[in-house]
């Protein structure tokens, strides 16, 4: 999906009003020195591409993020504010239902959510672009 035509300000508002707080709750109890961000993004569409990938694509050691509250709210925000996004996600959602497992918060998941917080920071304020 090409995120170029999303309403970035509305997505930012959704993030700051709820999603950010859910991410903080998920990370509660984790030391702020624990994880170094290794995933970066250069502009808002790129940030959303990386955010979508880390939030919804299962990775080795962390298969369950898509069922977390912040993920569901992220999905809703993208569906509302990115034209045509929900249509592209129907197949992905059906595939995800088939491999649904119980929620487990692993260290790998915590690291992934720390990466997500960093990506959202850059989405909110693309550093090097005269926005």
């Amino acid at each position: 999906y090409d995120f170029t035509n999303c309403d970035f300000e509305k997505i930012k508002a959704a993030y700051l009003s709820t999603i950010s707080k859910d991410l903080i709750t998920y990370m509660s109890g984790t030391k702020s020195t624990e994880f170094n961000n290794t995933v970066s993004c250069s502009n808002r569409p790129h940030c959303l591409t990386e955010i979508q990938s880390l939030t919804f694509n299962p990775t080795a050691g962390c298969a369950s993020l898509a069922k977390e509250m912040f993920a569901m709210k992220t999905k809703a925000a993208l569906a509302i504010w990115c034209p045509g996004y929900s249509e592209t996600q129907i197949n992905a959602t059906q595939a995800m239902k088939k491999r649904r497992k119980r929620k487990v918060t692993t260290n790998k998941c915590l690291e992934q959510v720390s990466q997500l917080q960093g990506l959202w920071r850059r989405f909110n304020r693309p550093l090097l672009k005269q926005q």
Partner: antibody
Framework: QVQLQQSGAELVRPGTSVKVSCKAS????????IEWVKQRPGQGLEWIGV????????NYNENFKGKATLTADKSSSTAYIELSRLTSEDSAVYFC????????????WGQGTTLTVSS | SIVMTQTPKFLLVSAGDRVTISCKAS??????VTWYQQKPGQSPKLLIY???NHYTGVPDRFTGSGYGTDFTFTISSVQAEDLAVYFC?????????FGAGTKLELK
């Protein structure tokens, strides 16, 4: 806890350069941007620029291009601002600050470094 | 650059007063406005981010509102420890810019 510790006050001659440091602790240094802000005595706040310690990317206020250079040393978790060709107009308190967890504000600030340029 | 025009420059207050500070942006900054408090000889402290969100530990008497170009910062009931200079800042476009500040002084 998060802390930004800046180097001490400087008294320097016009035409020279100075390098002010900002040592970060209590968080993963490369995860958050570091901002620099100038405040002249009794005046408001002026944003100088920002650096991403993770990759060294910077963005400067046009008013400070050629005047300020921002760098960061990952190994020591320290950000630096170098000010060159100093004049009396550069006499001010310089603050470093960290972006907050959402990327929309500055949540932790250094204590400030007073720079006095005088002959 | 976006100019943030902050008014008034000074406010004479008594404990318990309701205080309102205005900040007007020269062009729309959406909701990207932050408010800071600075006491003499100290660094600024973050109070409100993204127009109306309280930073951790900031008392409820501090509130922010607005959108686009017009923003308001309110202290519902001023306490002695609130005597300080307050700055608005826009976080929407580079270069980031601050208002000139509003100094709260005791009547």
């Amino acid at each position: 806890q998060v802390q930004l510790q800046q180097s001490g006050a400087e008294l320097v001659r016009p035409g020279t350069s100075v390098k002010v440091s900002c040592k970060a602790s209590g968080y993963a240094f490369t995860n958050y941007l570091i901002e620099w802000v100038k405040q002249r005595p009794g005046q408001g706040l002026e944003w100088i620029g920002v650096i991403d310690p993770g990759n060294g990317d910077t963005n400067y206020n046009e008013n400070f291009k050629g005047k300020a250079t921002l760098t960061a040393d990952k190994s020591s978790s320290t950000a630096y601002i170098e000010l060159s060709r100093l004049t009396s107009e550069d006499s001010a308190v310089y603050f470093c600050a960290r972006e907050d967890n959402t990327g929309t504000a500055f949540d932790y600030w250094g204590q400030g470094t007073t720079l006095t340029v005088s002959s | 650059s976006i100019v943030m025009t902050q008014t008034p420059k000074f406010l004479l207050v008594s404990a318990g007063d309701r205080v309102t500070i205005s900040c007007k942006a020269s062009q729309s900054v959406s909701s990207d406005v932050t408010w800071y408090q600075q006491k003499p000889g100290q660094s600024p402290k973050l109070l409100i981010y993204y127009v109306s969100n309280h930073y951790t530990g900031v008392p409820d008497r501090f509130t922010g509102s607005g959108y686009g170009t017009d923003f308001t910062f309110t202290i519902s009931s001023v306490q002695a420890e609130d005597l300080a200079v307050y700055f608005c800042q826009q976080h929407h476009r580079f270069p980031l810019t601050f208002g000139a500040g509003t100094k709260l002084e005791l009547k």
